[in-house]
Amino acid sequence: APVRSLNCTLRDSQQKSLVMSGPYELKALHLQGQDMEQQVVFSMSFVQGEESNDKIPVALGLKEKNLYLSCVLKDDKPTLQLESVDPKNYPKKKMEKRFVFNKIEINNKLEFESAQFPNWYISTSQAENMPVFLGGTKGGQDITDFTMQFVSS
């Protein structure tokens, strides 16, 4: 069976939107009005992995682009990147672990924990216009909580 996917946008808990910044980077910034069209639309695929009531494994691709968020070690540091894939083979139910995030719902907010690097989360800075990153903290300055907005196909 084909992998189930849905289209969505994500905003952090400060209401910053995610936009492309160059070919392989996402930034978080406040958008208004027509500028909202700049925000990236994700194709969130529900993939194989450890699952529970409030924890669902997903992959986050960029809609109609052969790019997926992935987690890799760079300079000994778990790092978030946008990785190109062969569109003939993706998305798939059994995604490589670097592409998998545990979508965790807490108090109507979502966290995205790396499956490859437990206790590392998709994060944004309090500062405007900074790259989205894989962060190792929760509950401090950096933001790990998101809301999801569904986008019709």
């Epitope: 900074m130 903290t137 300055q141 950096d142």
Partner: antibody
Framework: QVQLVQSGAEVKKPGASVKVSCKAS????????MHWVRQAPGQGLEWMGL????????VNNQKFKGRVTMTRDTSTSTVYMELSSLRSEDTAVYYC???????????WGQGTLVTVSS | EIVMTQSPATLSVSPGERATFSCRAS??????IHWYQQRPGQAPRLLIK???NDVEGIPARFSGSGSGTEFTLTISSLQSEDFADYYC??????????FGQGTKLEIK
Amino acid sequence: QVQLVQSGAEVKKPGASVKVSCKASGFSFTGYYMHWVRQAPGQGLEWMGLIIPHNDYTVNNQKFKGRVTMTRDTSTSTVYMELSSLRSEDTAVYYCARSDYYGAMDYWGQGTLVTVSS
Amino acid sequence: EIVMTQSPATLSVSPGERATFSCRASQNIGTSIHWYQQRPGQAPRLLIKYASNDVEGIPARFSGSGSGTEFTLTISSLQSEDFADYYCQQGSSWPPFTFGQGTKLEIK
């Protein structure tokens, strides 16, 4: 209020090790990156490494080639920095500081003077 | 490793005048630069974060600007307590975090 309180001054012989502590209070300890920065007499600031209390990840400045070990105790909100194989050039004030991911170090400990002398 | 170069090494300015510090990064760091003041015998103090963002408790006479590789810290009207050492630091690409070598602000 936010506080980082470090252990007291140390005098060590060359070849020995020193362990400096930094006790955090007034904030969510696991919500920040905890750094160690040193300053030799009359010199500038040098980043030594960091530890993330939330997941126990550590990374060091390559310059120290494995001489630095950073640990944490979440039960007491304390981070530790141990520097081994001490030499006279390690005489410095050692600071702990907290930051966000991009390294804005908004609170610092008072500093710990480590003197290495034979 | 990103190298941060501060200039000048020493800056001599009269009280009440404007002081301008420069910091250059060896590669593009966007706005991921922070400025610190260090008075003799004290720990560094964060003055400006993310190139131009204010820090709570820091007087309004301190401001920052720049992006990419060229950055400036300005003190609009020098007070006696401002004579100290000033450091820039990048957080764009780590490890390692790197500091500039510092600028000493002295009374002219």
